[in-house]
C-alpha cells in the first residue's frame, strides 16, 4: 500500500489494515478508510472501515457477522435469479462470473418482456432489462422479479400490492412495495438489490437521469408517444403558464473536501447549461449545507431564471463558507428548500399548482445531525398536495434526485429521499467526483440534443473534434497542381459552409475531399454551390487582381451526416436555433440577433486553426466600432492592393475585419484556415458570424506561424448577416428555421 505505517491524523494505526490484492486510501482525515480493488474485483468482507474512539479500526465482519482476519480483493460475481416466474433460465448456477450469460424463455401462453439474454457486467450488475413472463391476465402487467430480489405477491388486480426483499447484507434500491394503480401502471419504481461495492457507471447515470429529467422538462402531448400495447411514459403537457423550479442542494460538509465540492459545482453548471439547452427557463434555488444551510439563490429572486446569473452565483460559492460548522444536516438543507417553496395559508402564488419542483441533492452520504430528512420530503409533498387525491395524485409535480458520491454513502438513506417513479431512476451512487463529472458531461450531450447547434463537449477527455464538432477539413486535389487545403463548418446534416475561393470552376466533385469529426474517411460531394455574386476576376480591369466579395460556398453532401459528439452543426445567424442558443425570446428578430452578436464595438470572437495536426482555438477581436476604419484601411498593405485608391473597392460591406494589436494582439489566419468559421462564443454556445476569406500578410510562410507580425496584419471574413438571402434560399430544406 502507498501509505507509510505511521498513525494518520485520526488515532488508528495503519498496521495490518492492508488488503490482499488491492490498496486502501484514507478518508475524512484518517477517520475512515476505503479499500480499492482492481476492476472486476471487490473488497471482501467490507469496502470501508472506520476508526473507533478506542484507537482501533472497525472489525472485518462478513454479511453473516463472521469475523475475518485480513481483507482481500475477490472476483465480482453477479447474483443469481432467486425466482423466475412462468418460465426457465439457463444456465443455472449459484453465482455468475463477469461476462457469463444467461438466457430466459417463457412457458406456453406467456410472453417475454425485457431482455431474453443478459450478461454479467464488471460492476456486478446484469446487462439489459428484467426478463418477465406474462400472460396479460392481470389488471396490471406482471411487475417482474429483478435479479437478486425476492417478490411476495402474485395477484395483479387493481390495488393489489407486491413487496420485494433483498438477501442479507444487500440494500434495496427503489420501491419495496408497489401497488397496481388505475390505468394499469405500478406505483413506485423497479427495485434492485445493491451490494456496497456496486456503483452506477457514468453512462448508466447519464442515461437514467437524463431520461427522467427529460420526462420532467419536455413539453410533450400527453396523448402522444405510445403505440398500442406500449406502456405510456410519463409525459407532461408543459402548460405555457406553468413553470419549473429546480433546487440545487450541495453538501459542503467536512467529509466532501474542497476538490469534490469544486467538482460538484462543475456538475451543476453543466446541468444548468443542459436545462437551458432545452429552451425551458426554470427558476433556480441554490443551497449549500453542512451543519447549517446557506441559501445563495432564492427561486423568488428576479434573476433566478437567468441561467447565466445563477451560474455566476454558483461559481462564486466557496467551500470555506461552511468551514467552521462542518457537520452534515441534510434535514435543515431540505427545510431551506421547503421555505422557498412555501407560502402563507390559503395564499398560494398564481400557478402554484402548475409549477413543477425538482430537487437535486448531491451528497457524500451520511446525515449525522438534525434528524431524518425524509420528514421534510413528506412536508413538501403535503405542501404541494402530492399523493393526497387518488384521482389526481400530482406525482409529476415533484422530482427528488439524489446523487451519492463515494464509498461512505448510506444507500438506505439516499434511497428513502429519492422519488420513485415507474421506469425512472432518481437515486444514483457514483464511485467518486470524477465519475460524477463524467455523468454531467455525458448528460449534456445525449442524443436528444445532438441536433442543437453550437454545442460542444468541453470535457477533459474530449478530443479536438469534441471541442470543435462543426469543423470540416477540405482539400481539393488538382492533377499536376498539387492540392489546396481549406476549412469549413457543418451547418446542417447535408451542408458544409466554406469559402468560394477554395475552388475553381474546373474542380470536379470527385476531386474535392471533405472530412468531419476527425474521421479518416472522406465524404461524397453532390455539388458545390457558389454565391452568385462571387467573381474573383470581377475587378481585374480596374487593376485589382483578386476580388473576394461574396467569397462563400456551400458544399452539399451526397449522404446525410450522422450527428454525434464529434460531428454537429454550428449555429447560423438569424435562425431559430440561434435564438434558442442565445436564450432570446422566441419573438426575436434577425436585427435583434445582429445587435446581440455584432454590436458596434470590438467583439470577442474566435477561429479554429490546425497546428501540428491539432485543432486550436484562436481568440480575435472583430473591429466593429471605432477601430473598424483603421482595420479596413490596412487592406492596402495586401499584395496587389497597393495601387487601390479607394479601399472600399476591395473591402466591401460584406467583410468583417480582425487582426492588429489593439485592443489585443490578435493571432492571424493562415492559408489553410480559409473557409473556416469566424465564431462568437456566447452563453456556452458557438455561433458562426463569418467565413474566413483573405489576409493582408501571409504569417505562415514555411508552414510555421510567425510570432512577430506587423500591426497591419489584418484578416477579412465574409459577414454572414450580409449573405443571408442566399443562405436562406440554399438551406431552405434543412429545417434551420430562418427568421
Amino acid at each position: 500500500t502507498p501509505w507509510s505505517l505511521a498513525r494518520p491524523q485520526g488515532s488508528c494505526s495503519l498496521e495490518g489494515v492492508e488488503i490482499k490484492g488491492g490498496s486502501f486510501r484514507l478518508l475524512q482525515e484518517g477517520q475512515a478508510l476505503e479499500y480499492v480493488c482492481p476492476s472486476g474485483f471487490y473488497p471482501y468482507p467490507v469496502q470501508t472501515r472506520t476508526c473507533r474512539s478506542t484507537g482501533s479500526w472497525s472489525t472485518l465482519k462478513t454479511q453473516d457477522q463472521k469475523t475475518v482476519r485480513k481483507a482481500e480483493c475477490r472476483a465480482i460475481h453477479c447474483p443469481r435469479p432467486h425466482d423466475f416466474e412462468n418460465g426457465e433460465y439457463w444456465p443455472r448456477s449459484p453465482y455468475y462470473n463477469v461476462s457469463d450469460e444467461i438466457s430466459f424463455h417463457c412457458y406456453d401462453g406467456y410472453t417475454l418482456r425485457g431482455s431474453a439474454n443478459r450478461t454479467c457486467q464488471v460492476n456486478g450488475r446484469w446487462s439489459g432489462q428484467t426478463a418477465i413472463c406474462d400472460n396479460g391476465a392481470g389488471y396490471c402487467s406482471n411487475p417482474g422479479i429483478p435479479i437478486g430480489t425476492r417478490k411476495v405477491g402474485s395477484q395483479y388486480r387493481l390495488e393489489d400490492s407486491v413487496t420485494y426483499h433483498c438477501s442479507r447484507g444487500l440494500t434495496l434500491r427503489g420501491s419495496q412495495r408497489r401497488t397496481c394503480q388505475e390505468g394499469g401502471s405500478w406505483s413506485g419504481t423497479e427495485p434492485s438489490c445493491q451490494d456496497s461495492f456496486m456503483y452506477d457507471t457514468p453512462q448508466e447515470v447519464a442515461e437514467a437521469f437524463l431520461s427522467s429529467l427529460t420526462e420532467t422538462i419536455e413539453g410533450v402531448d400527453a396523448e402522444d408517444g405510445h403505440g398500442p400495447g406500449e406502456q405510456q411514459k410519463r409525459k407532461i403537457v408543459l402548460d405555457p403558464s406553468g413553470s419549473m423550479n429546480i433546487y440545487l442542494v450541495l453538501d459542503g460538509s467536512d467529509s466532501i473536501g474542497a476538490s469534490n465540492f469544486t467538482g460538484a459545482k462543475k456538475c451543476l453548471v453543466n446541468l444548468i447549461e443542459k436545462v437551458a439547452s432545452y429552451g425551458v427557463k426554470p427558476r433556480y434555488g441554490l443551497v449549500t449545507y453542512a451543519t447549517y444551510p446557506k441559501i445563495w439563490v432564492k427561486v423568488s429572486e428576479a434573476d433566478s431564471s437567468n441561467a447565466d446569473w445563477v451560474t455566476k452565483q454558483l461559481n462564486e460559492i466557496n467551500y470555506e463558507d461552511h468551514k467552521l460548522k462542518s457537520g452534515t444536516n441534510t434535514k435543515k438543507a431540505l427545510q431551506a428548500v421547503y421555505s422557498m417553496m412555501s407560502w402563507p395559508d390559503d395564499v398560494p402564488p398564481e400557478g402554484w399548482n402548475r409549477t413543477r419542483h425538482v430537487i437535486i441533492l448531491m451528497t457524500d452520504g451520511l446525515h449525522n445531525m438534525g434528524g431524518d430528512p425524509i420528514t421534510v420530503i413528506d412536508e413538501i409533498r403535503d405542501l404541494l398536495y402530492i399523493g393526497k387525491d387518488r384521482k389526481n395524485p400530482r406525482e409529476d409535480y415533484l422530482d427528488v434526485y439524489v446523487f451519492g458520491v463515494g464509498p461512505l454513502v448510506n444507500q438506505v438513506n439516499i434511497n428513502a429521499l429519492a422519488s420513485k417513479k415507474d421506469n425512472e431512476q432518481h437515486v444514483f451512487k457514483v464511485k467518486d467526483m470524477e465519475n460524477l463529472e463524467d455523468v454531467f458531461y455525458q448528460m449534456i450531450d445525449e442524443s436528444q440534443s445532438l441536433s442543437l447547434c453550437g454545442m460542444v463537449w468541453e470535457h477533459r477527455k474530449g478530443t479536438d473534434y469534441h471541442k470543435q464538432p462543426w469543423q470540416a477539413k477540405i482539400s481539393v486535389i488538382r492533377p499536376s497542381k498539387g492540392h489546396e487545403s481549406c476549412m469549413g463548418a457543418v451547418v446542417s446534416e447535408y451542408f458544409v459552409l466554406t469559402a468560394a475561393h477554395c475552388f475553381t470552376v474546373d474542380d470536379k466533385e470527385h476531386s474535392i475531399k471533405v472530412s468531419v469529426g476527425g474521421e479518416k474517411r472522406d465524404l461524397e460531394i453532390e455539388v458545390v454551390l457558389f454565391h452568385p455574386n462571387y467573381n474573383i476576376n470581377g475587378k481585374k480591369e480596374a487593376g485589382i487582381p483578386e476580388f473576394y466579395d461574396y467569397d462563400v460556398a456551400l458544399i452539399k453532401l451526397k449522404n446525410k451526416l450522422k450527428y454525434g459528439q464529434t460531428i454537429r452543426p454550428i449555429c447560423l445567424p438569424c435562425t431559430e436555433g440561434t435564438t434558442r442558443a442565445l436564450r432570446l425570446p422566441p419573438t426575436t428578430t434577425c436585427q435583434q440577433q445582429k445587435e446581440e452578436l455584432l454590436p458596434a464595438q470590438d467583439i470577442k470572437a474566435l477561429f479554429v486553426s490546425e497546428e501540428e495536426k491539432k485543432l486550436t482555438r484562436k481568440e480575435v477581436y472583430i473591429k466593429n466600432g471605432d477601430k473598424k476604419g483603421s482595420c479596413e484601411r490596412d487592406a492596402q498593405y495586401a499584395p496587389g492592393y497597393d495601387k487601390v485608391k479607394d479601399i472600399s473597392e476591395v473591402v466591401t460591406p460584406r467583410f468583417l475585419c480582425t487582426g492588429g494589436v489593439s485592443p489585443y494582439a490578435d493571432p492571424n489566419t493562415c492559408r489553410g484556415d480559409s473557409g473556416g468559421p469566424l465564431i462568437v462564443h456566447k452563453r456556452s454556445r458557438f455561433i458562426q458570424v463569418g467565413v474566413i476569406s483573405w489576409g493582408v500578410v501571409d504569417v505562415c510562410k514555411n508552414q510555421k506561424r510567425q510570432k512577430q507580425v506587423p500591426a497591419h496584419a489584418r484578416d477579412f471574413h465574409i459577414n454572414l448577416f450580409q449573405v443571408l438571402p442566399w443562405l436562406k434560399e440554399k438551406l431552405q430544406d434543412e429545417d434551420l428555421g430562418f427568421l
Epitope: 407560502w343 390559503d346 398560494p348 398564481e350 400557478g351
Partner: antibody
Framework: EVQLQQSGPELVKPGASVKMSCKAS????????MNWVKQSHGKSLEWIGR????????FYNQRFKGKATLTVDKSSSTAHMELRSLTSEDSALYYC???????????WGQGTLVTVSA | DIVMTQAAFSNPVTLGTSASISCSSS???????????LYWYLQRPGQSPQLLIY???NLASGVPDRFSGSGSGTDFTLRISRVEAEDVGVYYC?????????FGGGTKLEIK
C-alpha cells in the same frame, strides 16, 4: 365579466339570525376561495373567514367563530353567510370578496347592509 | 394577530402633486419564500373596496401606474405620483401573511 352579486339589505331583531348570499358569475366558482369581510359604520375592514367552494372547507377568524357560518351551493354558484344571535354590534356592511391566489381580493360584491334593531 | 397601523388622515394634497400614505405592521410581512404579503385597497365614497397593489409593490390589473408601493418588512408606503380627483377615498393596507388576515384602520386622502 366577473361579478359578485350580493343579496339586499336586512333589518333584523336582536337575538335573531340572518342569512345573506353572494352569487358569482363570469368565472368557475369552485376555482377561487370566497371570503367575507365586515365593515362597521365609519370603521375599518375586518376579515370574517373564507370558504373553499370546491369542497366546502371553511376557515374562520377566531373572533367570528360561533357567530358566522359559511356555506356554498355549487349548483347555483352561490356563497352564503349566516350570522346568529345578532346584537347591535353586528350592524354593518358585509362584503363577499374573491381571493385570487396571492393577488389579494381582486373582486368584491357591492355589500349587504345588516341593521340590528329592536 | 398582526396589527396594521395607519394614520387616519393624510396631509392634504393639491391635485396634480404627489401623495404618500404610510402603513406599518406589528410583525415583518416578509415570508421565507422572499415575498412580502402586504396589500393596498382603495375605497371610494359609497363603493366597495378595490385592490390597488398586491405583494407590496405589484400593480393590480387596471390600476393606473400613478400608484406604486414600496417598503421593508414592517414599514410600507403607497405613493400616488399625480393625484387626480378620482383618487379621493380611504386607503387600507392589509396583510395576508398570517390568518386572521388583518386590515389597517384606513387613511383618508384629503384634497386641498
Amino acid at each position: 365579466e366577473v361579478q359578485l352579486q350580493q343579496s339586499g339589505p336586512e333589518l333584523v331583531k336582536p337575538g335573531a339570525s340572518v342569512k345573506m348570499s353572494c352569487k358569482a358569475s363570469g368565472y368557475s366558482f369552485t376555482d377561487y376561495l370566497m371570503n367575507w369581510v365586515k365593515q362597521s359604520h365609519g370603521k375599518s375592514l375586518e376579515w370574517i373567514g373564507r370558504i373553499n367552494p370546491y369542497n366546502g372547507d371553511a376557515f374562520y377568524n377566531q373572533r367570528f367563530k360561533g357567530k358566522a357560518t359559511l356555506t356554498v351551493d355549487k349548483s347555483s354558484s352561490t356563497a352564503h353567510m349566516e350570522l346568529r344571535s345578532l346584537t347591535s354590534e353586528d350592524s354593518a356592511l358585509y362584503y363577499c370578496a374573491r381571493l385570487e391566489n396571492d393577488y389579494g381580493f381582486t373582486y368584491w360584491g357591492q355589500g349587504t347592509l345588516v341593521t340590528v334593531s329592536a | 394577530d398582526i396589527v396594521m397601523t395607519q394614520a387616519a388622515f393624510s396631509n392634504p394634497v393639491t391635485l396634480g402633486t404627489s401623495a404618500s400614505i404610510s402603513c406599518s405592521s406589528s410583525k415583518s410581512l416578509l415570508h421565507s419564500n422572499g415575498i412580502t404579503y402586504l396589500y393596498w385597497y382603495l375605497q371610494r365614497p359609497g363603493q366597495s373596496p378595490q385592490l390597488l397593489i398586491y405583494r407590496m409593490s405589484n400593480l393590480a390589473s387596471g390600476v393606473p401606474d400613478r400608484f406604486s408601493g414600496s417598503g421593508s418588512g414592517t414599514d410600507f408606503t403607497l405613493r400616488i405620483s399625480r393625484v387626480e380627483a378620482e383618487d379621493v377615498g380611504v386607503y387600507y393596507c392589509a396583510q395576508m401573511l398570517e390568518r386572521p388576515w388583518t386590515f389597517g384602520g384606513g387613511t383618508k386622502l384629503e384634497i386641498k
